[in-house]
C-alpha cells in the first residue's frame, strides 16, 4: 500500500494554517488499525502517533519550511512511509507603512505622553519597526514583533521633541518607511515679566508710557492683557510670540499699580505688580512720574 | 505616478515679487519635504530650502532667508515659493524636488521655472 | 557652509572609456547620525537633475550598473565604466549632511 502526504493549502501564507492528511488510496483506514505520524525535515510533529490522519498546524510561519512526510503503522507494527513533501511558506512583505500619534493630530502638551503608532497594512512574519526623528533621521529604537503594529513612546514630551517623525517597518523585503508627521509640542506660558518705559528718567504728564509685557515662554499666538488697578487698559497679540507692548498717554491719574496677563489658550498668567507714583522735584512746575 | 508641475515661465522687474507654484501629484502630499533648488544661467545649483505641506513648517539656507518665503496648500497639493525685492541676480531657473526620507535623496524634480528679470 | 568641489571641470570622453570624477568635501560629511550624505545627480541640457547614486555607494533603481560611488569623509568618486551617448551632460555632487546643503560646481562629460 502506498501512502501520500497531502498539505492544505499546498503553499500557505505566513500565519495562516494548514492541514496535513496522511492518505492511502487503496486502502481504508477503517479495513485495519492505523497509527499516524507527521514528520518535518528529522522532528516528528504535533502528538506523535495518533489515530488521526490529519495533523492541523494553527499557523505557519517561514522557517516551518521544509520537507515534510507522514508515516502509518498497523497494528502488525509495520510501517508505511509517504516521500517528502516540501511546503514553501510564504512570506508577505510590508506594504503601506503608517505612522500616527497619540494624541492624534501630533499636538502634545509639555510634560504629557506622547505614542508613536507604526502600522503596516500588510506583511507576516517578524516585522522589524524602527522609529526615526527628523527627516535627516536619527534612530530612536527598534522593536521587532509579530504584529501589524507597533508603539515608542515618550512619556514626557520636551520642547526639544517638537520635530518631524517617521517610522520604517522590515520583514526581509527591504525597508518601507511612512510618511513625516510633524510634532508640535504646546507650552503654556510662563508668568510674564512687565516692563514700564517712559521716554526720560522722569516721565511727566502727556508723556507717552510703554508698557511691556513679555512671557519668556509659551506657545504663540499669545494674548496680553493690560491692567491699572485691575482695571482693562486694553489688549495686544503676539502672533509668533515674543512680547507686546501697550502705549498710554499720561494724565495724573496714571498712578498707581500696573500689571500684564498673558494667556496662549493652554493658561493664563499675570505678571507682578509694578508700582508708578507721581513725585513732585523741588522747584519743578509740573508733576513727574517714577516707577 | 508621481509627479511635480512647475508654474511657467515669468518675466518681471526688478524690485517686484514673484510666485512660483509646485503642484504634487501620485502621492501623499503632506508625507515628504519639498525642496527648492536655484540654477543661475550656465552655472550650478543652490539649495535654498524646504517645506514641509503636513504644517508648514521650514528650513532655509541663510543666503535666501528674506528673500524667500515657501507656503503651501494641503487643499490643492501645491508648494509655493516667493521671491521678493527681485534683483538680477535673482534671474535663474528655479526647480523644486522630493527628498524622501530613510533613503534619503530627491526622488522626482519639478520641470524648473525660468525667472527672468527685465527693465 | 561645506564646499563642495568637484574635478575635472569638463571631461572630454569617447563612447565606451572608463573615467572617474572627483568631488572633495571642505569638512567630514559624516552626519552626527553616522550616515554620510553625500549624493551624484546628472542634468542633461534643459532638463532637471536626475539622481544616479545616493548615500555614497547606492545606485537608484533604474541606475545602469556602469555608474558606481565609492568614498568616504572628505574624498568621493564617481566612476562610469563605460560611457554611453546618453551619459553625456553635468554631473553633480551633493551634501545632504549639513545645512545648508550643498552642490558641486558640477563636471560636464562631453564628447571629445
Known amino acids: 500500500a502506498e501512502l501520500f502526504l497531502i498539505a492544505s493549502p499546498s503553499h500557505p501564507t505566513e500565519g495562516s494554517p494548514v492541514t496535513l492528511t496522511c492518505k492511502m488510496p487503496f486502502l481504508q483506514s477503517s479495513d485495519a488499525q492505523f497509527q499516524f505520524c507527521f514528520f518535518r525535515d528529522t522532528r516528528a510533529l504535533g502528538p506523535g502517533w495518533s489515530s488521526s490522519p490529519k495533523l492541523q498546524i494553527a499557523a505557519m510561519w517561514k522557517e516551518d519550511t521544509g520537507s515534510y512526510w507522514c508515516e502509518a503503522q498497523t497494528m502488525a507494527s509495520k510501517v508505511l512511509r509517504s516521500r517528502r513533501s516540501q511546503i514553501n511558506v510564504h512570506r508577505v512583505p510590508v506594504a503601506d507603512v503608517s505612522l500616527e500619534t497619540q494624541p492624534p493630530g501630533g499636538q502634545v502638551m509639555e510634560g504629557d505622553r506622547l505614542v508613536l503608532i507604526c502600522s503596516v497594512a500588510m506583511g507576516t512574519g517578524d516585522i522589524t519597526f524602527l522609529w526615526y526623528k527628523g527627516a535627516v533621521g536619527l534612530n530612536l529604537q527598534s522593536k521587532t514583533q509579530r504584529s501589524l503594529t507597533a508603539e515608542y513612546e515618550i512619556p514626557s514630551v520636551r520642547e526639544s521633541d517638537a520635530e518631524q517623525y517617521y517610522c520604517v517597518a522590515e520583514n526581509g523585503y527591504g525597508p518601507s518607511p511612512s510618511g513625516l508627521v510633524s510634532i508640535t509640542v504646546r507650552i503654556p506660558v510662563s508668568r510674564p515679566i512687565l516692563m514700564l518705559r517712559a521716554p526720560r528718567a522722569q516721565a511727566a504728564v502727556e508723556d507717552v508710557l510703554e508698557l511691556h509685557c513679555e512671557a519668556l515662554r509659551g506657545s504663540p499666538p499669545i494674548l496680553y492683557w493690560f491692567y491699572h488697578e485691575d482695571i482693562t487698559l486694553g489688549s495686544r497679540s503676539a502672533p509668533s510670540g515674543g512680547g507686546a507692548s501697550f502705549n498710554l498717554s499720561l494724565t495724573e491719574e496714571h498712578s498707581g499699580n500696573y500689571s500684564c496677563e498673558a494667556n496662549n489658550g493652554l493658561g493664563a498668567q499675570r505678571s507682578e505688580a509694578v508700582t508708578l507714583n507721581f513725585t513732585v522735584p523741588t522747584g519743578a512746575r509740573s508733576n513727574h512720574l517714577t516707577s | 505616478q508621481v509627479q511635480l508641475q512647475q508654474s511657467g515661465p515669468e518675466l518681471v522687474k526688478p524690485g517686484a515679487s514673484v510666485r512660483i507654484s509646485c503642484k504634487a501629484s501620485g502621492y501623499t502630499f503632506t508625507s515628504y519635504n519639498i525642496h527648492w533648488v536655484k540654477q543661475r544661467p550656465g552655472q550650478g545649483l543652490e539649495w535654498i530650502g524646504w517645506i514641509y505641506p503636513g504644517d508648514g513648517n521650514t528650513k532655509y539656507n541663510e543666503k535666501f532667508k528674506g528673500k524667500t518665503t515657501l507656503t503651501a496648500d494641503k487643499s490643492s497639493s501645491t508648494a509655493y515659493m516667493q521671491l521678493s525685492s527681485l534683483t538680477s541676480e535673482d534671474s535663474a531657473v528655479y526647480f523644486c524636488?522630493?527628498?524622501?526620507?530613510?533613503?534619503?535623496?530627491?526622488?522626482?524634480w519639478g520641470q524648473g521655472t525660468t525667472l527672468t528679470l527685465s527693465s | 557652509d561645506v564646499l563642495m568641489t568637484q574635478t575635472p571641470l569638463s571631461l572630454p570622453v569617447s563612447l565606451g572609456d572608463q573615467v572617474s570624477i572627483s568631488c572633495r568635501s571642505g569638512q567630514t560629511i559624516v552626519h552626527s547620525n553616522g550616515n554620510t550624505y553625500l549624493e551624484w545627480y546628472l542634468q542633461k541640457p534643459g532638463q532637471s537633475p536626475k539622481l544616479l547614486i545616493y548615500k555614497v555607494s547606492n545606485r537608484f533603481s533604474g541606475v545602469p550598473d556602469r555608474f558606481s560611488g565609492s568614498g568616504s569623509g572628505t574624498d568621493f568618486t564617481l566612476r562610469i565604466s563605460r560611457v554611453e551617448a546618453e551619459d553625456l551632460g553635468v554631473y553633480y555632487c551633493?551634501?545632504?549632511?549639513?545645512?545648508?546643503?550643498?552642490f558641486g560646481g558640477g563636471t560636464k562629460l562631453e564628447i571629445k
Open positions: 551633493f551634501q545632504g549632511s549639513h545645512v545648508p546643503w550643498t
Open positions: 524636488a522630493r527628498r524622501i526620507h530613510y533613503f534619503d535623496y530627491f526622488d522626482y
